[in-house]
């Protein structure tokens, strides 16, 4: 399975969209997990609503939000207020009973804000406009990269 690389700026939001066959995955919840090492388990971060018909509702765990458009076949994960510690390998998963099928592997890279490397002494930013919450701007570039990470469940 190819790994998609997404880059986001520290402090901003990064949106990940995983597409799937809506009929094949009918009735299945989706999850976003973080892979622990190249061959380690995938640790659940957040999953969609327990009632599949309500999967369109946003579910949050900390700064990570997930929502599933089950008709279109797109699950969207938003990593808000991106931090350096958020960098790493993740998976979008489709859950069926006790099985987890990998829909997509995503490598998240966090870029430091160039302003952090300068003396921003006289720069003033209003507090309410520094968050980018709700804008969900995909401040990222993406590319495909072949990796040898095995699928995990």
């Amino acid at each position: 399975l190819n790994t998609t690389v997404l880059q986001g700026m520290a402090g901003q939001s990064l949106r990940v969209s995983c597409t799937y066959d809506a009929l094949k995955h009918w009735g299945r919840r989706k999850a976003w997990c973080r892979q622990l090492g190249e061959e380690g388990p995938c640790q659940r971060v957040v999953s969609t609503h327990g009632v599949w018909l309500l999967a369109f509702l946003k579910k949050r765990n900390g700064s990570t939000v997930i929502a599933d458009d089950t008709l279109a076949g797109t699950v969207t994960i938003t990593l808000k207020n991106l931090q350096a510690g958020d960098a790493g390998l993740y998976q979008c998963q489709s859950l069926r009973g006790r099985e987890a099928e990998v829909l997509q592997k995503v490598l998240v890279e966090v870029l430091e804000d160039p302003l952090d490397d300068q003396d921003a002494g006289d720069l003033w930013v209003p507090e309410e406009s520094s968050s980018f919450e709700g804008a969900q701007v995909e401040h990222s570039t993406s590319r495909n990269q072949e990796t040898s990470f095995p699928p995990t469940s």
Partner: antibody, heavy 122, light 108 residues
Framework: EVQLVQSGAEVKKPGESLKISCKGS????????IGWVRQMPGKGLEWMGI????????RYSPSFQGQVTISADKSISTAYLQWSSLKASDTAMYYC???????????????WGQGTTVTVSS | EIVMTQSPGTLSLSPGERATLSCRAS???????LAWYQQKPGQAPRLLIY???SRATGIPDRFSGSGSGTDFTLTISRLEPEDFAVYYC?????????FGGGTKVEIK
């Protein structure tokens, strides 16, 4: 009417190859998983594997992995079970069945074929 | 793999009696992924119950399913002559989607 129609009975010799079929009709064949189940004479049901005809995603039981091949041709709404080299112990009734689903769960195998008898004898 | 164990192997009852069939899983199974089937001699199996307790289309209400975790039960409230058959449980919670060994309900 939703139905699965299987190919006819087969009599084969050990070492021969065989491909049996299961044709679906009355529903969207590509959007339901199709499973295969073995029943040896006088015995219970054994789950062999399952295929999603839409993209040919296939799962096997470890007991049957490498022993049989499950495939599908969505253009003619047909799933297949094949052997490259039959053994006497493959003598059994083989059923195909549709795996249904509902919102948030699974319907089990809700439509079954009539079964195909395979006899392997020298 | 999850091993499904059915008991008793054979149940000898008379028409009109209540039949209680047990199915035990070697590890916990989500009730959404537990089904029961009926098979008569010379016929393909027929789905009776899915999701542990939901009756399949056309199945009479004398058939009911219950249970959760590792213990599941199929109950036939009043046996009709056509109910004498072999019954199988199956889990499709985790591949391979194993069947139980079956319970034969025979006429006493």
């Amino acid at each position: 009417e939703v139905q699965l129609v299987q190919s006819g009975a087969e009599v084969k010799k050990p070492g021969e190859s065989l491909k049996i079929s299961c044709k679906g009709s009355g529903y969207s064949f590509t959007t339901y998983w199709i499973g295969w189940v073995r029943q040896m004479p006088g015995k219970g049901l054994e789950w062999m594997g399952i295929i999603y005809p839409g993209d040919s995603d296939t799962r096997y039981s470890p007991s049957f992995q490498g022993q049989v091949t499950i495939s599908a041709d969505k253009s003619i709404s047909t799933a297949y079970l094949q052997w490259s080299s039959l053994k006497a112990s493959d003598t059994a009734m083989y059923y195909c069945a549709r795996a249904g689903h509902y919102d948030g769960g699974h319907l089990g195998m809700d439509v079954w074929g009539q079964g195909t008898t395979v006899t392997v004898s020298s | 793999e999850i091993v499904m164990t059915q008991s008793p192997g054979t149940l000898s009852l008379s028409p009109g009696e209540r039949a209680t069939l047990s199915c035990r899983a070697s590890q916990s199974v989500s009730s959404s992924y537990l089904a029961w089937y009926q098979q008569k001699p010379g016929q393909a199996p027929r789905l009776l119950i899915y999701g542990a307790s939901s009756r399949a289309t056309g199945i009479p209400d004398r058939f009911s399913g219950s249970g959760s975790g590792t213990d599941f039960t199929l109950t036939i409230s009043r046996l009709e002559p056509e109910d004498f058959a072999v019954y199988y449980c199956q889990q499709d919670d985790r591949s391979p989607y194993t069947f139980g060994g079956g319970t034969k309900v025979e006429i006493k």
